[in-house]
Interface confidence: medium
Amino acid sequence: AIVLEEERYDLVEGQTLTVKCPFNIMKYANSQKAWQRLPDGKEPLTLVVTQRPFTRPSEVHMGKFTLKHDPSEAMLQVQMTDLQVTDSGLYRCVIYHPPNDPVVLFHPVRLVVTKGSSDVFTPVIIPITRLTERPILITTKYSPSDTTTTRSLPKPTAVVSSPGLGVTIINGTDADSVSTSS
């Protein structure tokens, strides 16, 4: 089995993590998607799943988890709000079709939540290619009065890319319109 490299993200309690997972629209338009946690040495724990009919755009809320599914954009967005230290762990976006093994959409996310200071970054993972289906990380400065990463990211925005992508910087306000050509 292929072992996927992890992407590590460090956040502070109270913040919101937003992950955008691209998927192959031709293969998975009519498939159920899910956000899973991978406890050490245990079976994956499915936290939230999309609902039928899977071809529809949808928003599913389950506690601190929100799954936004937009088939027309070939995108699954996951939000985890009000992060706590106990949320630290390994997570992944998958195509969910039990009893078969799930199909992992891209690299698992290693989330590390600390009590930390307020001078930290809030990450939003934005895919820039559907060929590799690897995410890039956009981080924005966090202030105590704003504990949520919003769609319109403030400037300046630093970009930390996955190895090999060759991306250096993206204007934060354009982050949601990064093209994902097939």
């Epitope: 609902q51 039928r52 928003e59 937009d70 088939p71």
Partner: antibody
């Protein structure tokens, strides 16, 4: 309490376009987890689902009507609309707008709120 | 499209009777089935969702069961206000489809 109200002409001439609007009150059309549908019922017959629109503008139309149907949404007015082109007498029906709900904890979509329906007659 | 077949298309019953209506899907739809009641000149009203869950405000004499392809709506003790037409509807796949309806009339 969510309420839906259909409005539009009750008489349409053959070959013309049927246009109806559904006004939603008591709730926002922009809320995620809801699909805004049109359903029709021919006189004395069963229910036929026409299609839905999501607040983002995404639509799905019943393949049997797809070539003639357009559903649009105006979130600022909390309304969504139906246009059915090239109508014939076979399109004479009561047209309902309804909310298709997939709220958390409900394992299936279901039409939980309906308009009262409006009869549209296609005749010259 | 998934075809939904209801039976019977009509039935006559008396107040107090136990009434059963069946709905069959042309392929498995798990529990993605809803039941509606419609009275003349009115919009349909949701009774049961997810095959067996009672919609808020609906009397407990209504119940639903089944999964896969075969489903049942049961009225344990028919009341005068229950004389109406009942429809099943699947939400497993788009396009959404309804059964042809079952008209419950007074005997």
């Amino acid at each position: 309490q969510v309420q839906l109200q259909e409005s539009g002409p009750g008489l349409v001439k053959p070959s013309q376009t049927l246009s109806l609007t559904c006004t939603v009150s008591g709730g926002s059309i922009s809320s995620g987890g809801y699909y805004w549908s049109w359903i029709r019922q021919h006189p004395g017959k069963g229910l036929e689902w026409i299609g839905y629109i999501y607040y983002s503008g995404s639509t799905y139309y019943n393949p049997s009507l797809k070539s003639r149907v357009t559903i649009s949404v105006d979130t600022s007015k909390n309304q969504f609309s139906l246009k059915l082109s090239s109508v014939t007498a076979a399109d004479t029906a009561v047209y309902y707008c309804a909310r298709d709900s997939s709220i958390a904890g409900r394992a299936t979509l279901s039409f939980d709120y309906w308009g009262q329906g409006t009869l549209v007659t296609v005749s010259s | 499209d998934i075809q939904m077949t209801q039976s019977p298309s009509s039935l006559s019953a008396s107040v107090g009777d136990r009434v059963t209506i069946t709905c069959r899907a042309s392929q498995s739809i798990s529990s993605y089935l809803n039941w509606y009641q419609q009275k003349p000149g009115k919009a349909p009203k949701l009774l049961i969702y997810a095959a067996s869950s009672l919609q808020s405000g609906v009397p407990s004499r209504f119940s639903g069961s089944g999964s896969g392809t075969d489903f049942t709506l049961t009225i344990s003790s028919l009341q005068p206000e229950d004389f109406a037409t009942y429809y099943c509807q699947q939400s497993f796949y788009d396009p959404i489809t309804f059964g042809g309806g079952t008209k419950v009339e007074i005997k």
